[in-house]
């Protein structure tokens, strides 16, 4: 059931980590992996990583994408390797934005 409480020994997954929160590591371990895209001062900011606390991931992953932010979540080792979050579009792109990977 979706709202079931996590088991005491929740499984941990290895995830790709890209972004400021990763320090000098390119992977992390958590209960869910994510890939996110947000618009910050006109830049597309791409990040990847782990939700290390079950409730945190549950909340964020259920949030529907908005014009300024999208998060895609998955469970499985390295499952966010080939996921790139997409902002919702209504047949048009957002003017004045640039792509930017936070490394």
């Amino acid at each position: 059931v979706e709202d079931e409480k996590p088991k005491v020994n929740q499984k941990l997954y290895m995830c790709v980590c890209e972004g400021l929160s990763c320090g000098n590591e390119d992977h992390c371990e958590g209960q869910q992996c994510f890939s996110s895209l947000s618009i910050n001062d006109g830049f597309h900011v791409y990040q990847k990583g782990c939700f290390q606390v079950y409730e945190q991931g549950k909340m964020t992953c259920k949030t529907p994408p908005s014009p300024g932010q999208a998060v895609e979540c998955c469970q499985g080792d390295w499952c966010n390797r080939n996921i790139t979050a997409q902002l919702p579009t209504k047949g048009k792109s957002f003017p004045g934005t640039q792509n930017f990977h936070l490394e």
Partner: antibody, heavy 119, light 112 residues
């Protein structure tokens, strides 16, 4: 089954360099981080660093930063460690180790490479 | 660096008896993800170390239930019940919560 097969023992001169190999089999090489560990004679274990075979990303123990270089060859599922400017302090057994998933720590170890530095 | 203090250095035991090894860390081993990355290894004479217990108390596959791990924060224990000849060797704790990873100095389990 998972195996990490390391290169053979080596006798090297002070000041020389050595490159040892660790050939992985029995699993998808790019899915597991490879760490390297040093064991000096009759002593405990020291962590040298790790390499992510998928990305090539590395992280080193500060103590070994100017001594060790970790690389991989994905096509042959082989990890390498080069040790440079060898001294007698570098005489030891060196292990390559697979870091397991689900927080299991180092789940599989190579058989070790005995390196002797002597003139 | 996190210092792992392992005691005793040597532990003479009788076959069929019990053994207890302690490992203390100089700082908490609770990771930001809530997990505690403290593991135990056995190195038999002439062999590579092998994983016994991961994340404090989880037995690795194939490890008999004579081995058990416990503890939290900075204080951890490995217990062996009904010691058998193949249990003899050097035991090491390892923390992988903080970089650099650090090992305990080892405990030699030997026959009394």
């Amino acid at each position: 089954q998972v195996k990490l097969l390391q290169s053979g023992a080596a006798l090297v001169k002070p000041g020389d360099s050595i490159r040892m190999s660790c050939k992985a089999s029995g699993y998808t090489f790019t899915d597991y981080i490879i760490h390297w560990v040093k064991q000096s004679h009759g002593k405990s274990l020291e962590w040298i660093g790790y390499i992510n075979p998928y990305s090539g990303g590395t992280n080193y123990n500060e103590k070994f930063k100017s001594k060790a270089t970790l690389t991989v060859d994905k096509s042959s599922s082989t990890a390498y460690m080069e040790f440079c400017r060898l001294t007698s302090e570098d005489s030891a057994i060196y292990y390559c180790v697979r870091r397991g998933h689900d927080g299991t720590g180092f789940d599989y170890w190579g058989q070790g490479v005995m390196v002797t530095v002597s003139s | 660096d996190v210092v792992m203090t392992q005691t005793p250095v040597s532990l003479p035991v009788s076959l069929g008896g019990q053994a207890s090894i302690s490992c203390r860390s100089s700082q908490s081993l609770v990771h930001s993800n809530g997990e505690t990355y403290l593991h135990w290894y056995l190195q038999k004479p002439g062999q590579s170390p092998q994983l016994l217990i991961y994340r404090v108390s989880n037995r690795f596959s194939g490890v008999p239930d004579r081995f058990s791990g416990s503890g939290s924060g900075t204080d951890f224990t490995l217990k062996l019940s009904r010691v058998e000849p193949e249990d003899l060797g050097d035991y090491y704790c390892l923390q992988s919560t903080h970089l650099p990873l650090t090992f305990g100095s080892g405990t030699k389990l030997e026959i009394k």
